[in-house]
Interface confidence: medium
C-alpha cells in the first residue's frame, strides 16, 4: 500500500536562501553542521539532477547504517525537491521505498514554510510503523535546525555570488554562485 504523511515546519530563513543551503548544498552542509545525525554523503552516480543516487551514512549509535537516495526532481523556480529512499535504513521486507517531496514557500515575514510529504510504499498489506515516521520527522527537523543555525551565524553564506568562508566547516574559501549550486542537490 501507499501511506502518505505530511507535515510542515517553519524557518526564519528566506525561502531562496534556505533552498540553496538545505536542498542544493545539503550534501556538503549536513555532515559538517550535524555530524551527530549524518556522518557522510557520497555521490554514487549522476551530477545532482534527476536520477542521481547518493549514499547517506549515519554515525554509530543510530538505528540504521545508511540509506541510498534517488533524486527525482529539482525545481529551482518553485523551490521544490523530490527524492526517494530506495535502499538501506528501513527499506526491506516490508517497505519498498519512501517517496519524498519538500517544498519551500516564502512567508510574509521574510521567513519560509517547508511543506514535506512522505509517501511510504509498503509491500503487500504491511503498514508503516509510527516510530519510523516519527524518527524520520525528527531527523529532518535536526538537519533543518542545524542548517538554520549555521545560516544565522554566517550572514553572507548562500547569498548569491558571495564569498563564503568555509573554515568553520573544515574547508577552504570558495565562491558559491547560482551555477555552482545547481550541481549540489540534497534533501
Amino acid at each position: 500500500g501507499v501511506f502518505n504523511y505530511e507535515t510542515e515546519t517553519t524557518s526564519v530563513i528566506p525561502a531562496a536562501r534556505l533552498f540553496k543551503a538545505f536542498i542544493l548544498d545539503g550534501d556538503n552542509l549536513f555532515p559538517k553542521v550535524a555530524p551527530q545525525a549524518i556522518s557522510s554523503v557520497e555521490n554514487i552516480e549522476g551530477n545532482g539532477g534527476p536520477g542521481t543516487i547518493k549514499k547517506i551514512s549515519f554515525p554509530e549509535g543510530l538505528p540504521f547504517k545508511y540509506v541510498k537516495d534517488r533524486v527525482d526532481e529539482v525545481d529551482h523556480t518553485n523551490f521544490k525537491y523530490n527524492y526517494a529512499v530506495i535502499e538501506g535504513g528501513p527499506i526491506g521486507d516490508t517497505l519498498e521505498k519512501i517517496s519524498n517531496e519538500i517544498k519551500i514557500v516564502a512567508t510574509p515575514d521574510g521567513g519560509s514554510i517547508l511543506k514535506i510529504s512522505n509517501k511510504y510504499h509498503t509491500k503487500g498489506d504491511h503498514e508503516v510503523k509510527a516510530e519510523q515516521v516519527k524518527a524520520s520527522k525528527e531527523m529532518g527537523e535536526t538537519l533543518l535546525r542545524a542548517v538554520e543555525s549555521y545560516l544565522l551565524a554566517h550572514s553572507d553564506a548562500y547569498n548569491e555570488q558571495k564569498l563564503i568562508s568555509e573554515e568553520d566547516l573544515g574547508g577552504e574559501q570558495k565562491l558559491i554562485s547560482e551555477e555552482d549550486l545547481h550541481h549540489h542537490h540534497h534533501h
Partner: antibody
Framework: EVQLVESGGGLVQPGGSLRLSCAAS????????MSWVRQAPGEGLEWVSV???????YYSDSVKGRFTISRHNSKNTLYLQMNSLRTEDTAVYYC?????????????WGQGTMVTVSS | DIQMTQSPSSLSASVGDRVTITCRAS??????LNWYQQKPGKAPNLLIY???SLQSGVPSRFSGSGSGTDFTLTISSLQPEDFGTYYC?????????FGQGTKLEIK
Amino acid sequence: EVQLVESGGGLVQPGGSLRLSCAASGFTVSSNSMSWVRQAPGEGLEWVSVIFSGGITYYSDSVKGRFTISRHNSKNTLYLQMNSLRTEDTAVYYCARHSNWNFDAFDIWGQGTMVTVSS
Amino acid sequence: DIQMTQSPSSLSASVGDRVTITCRASQSFDTYLNWYQQKPGKAPNLLIYATSSLQSGVPSRFSGSGSGTDFTLTISSLQPEDFGTYYCQQSYSIPYTFGQGTKLEIK
C-alpha cells in the same frame, strides 16, 4: 468522531472585544495546523489566521495587530481573541483543521459562530 | 498575495449535465489547490485536494484537474444534491486565498 465546535460569538459594539473558542474532539489540536476562516453575510470565504503545529502564527492583513490566534493543548481547544472590532468584522467565523495528509487542505470545519459588530 | 478568480460566478444546469467550474490563480503554483462545496447555512465541505485527489466520502462524479495557474472542477453528471456554492482555494502560500465562489443552481 472527529469534529470541531465553535462558541463565543455574539453582538459587540465597534471597538469591543470577543474571544472565540473551537473545541476539538477525535484528534489533537496541537498535532495539526489550524485556521480561522470567516464569511461575511452573503459573501465568500476569507482566511483570517493560522497557527502551525509548531506554534508559529500568521494573520491576514485585515486583522493583523487586532486578532490573536492561540491554542490550549490540554483543553484541545483553539482560540481567536478579537480586539478593536470593526463593523467589517461582522461574519460567521469557522475554525478549520489543516489535514496532515491532504496537502494542507481544510478537511474538517466547525459549524461556525456568528459575530455581529454593530452600534 | 495569490489572487484566485473563479468563473462563472453563477450557473444553472439540469440533472445529468456535465458541469465545469474554472479557477485561475494570479501566479503559478502546483499541487496546493483545493475545492470546497458549501450549502446555505452550512460550513464548507472539502471535495478535492491537491488539484485532483478526491476527498474520502466524496462521490466519484466530482473530479479536479489543472496545473500552473488554471484549475478546473468537473461534475460529470449533475445530481439534485449538488446545488450550492463552490470555492477554490490555494493552500500553497500565506495568506491562503479563496476564489469568490460559483453558485450552482439546479434547473
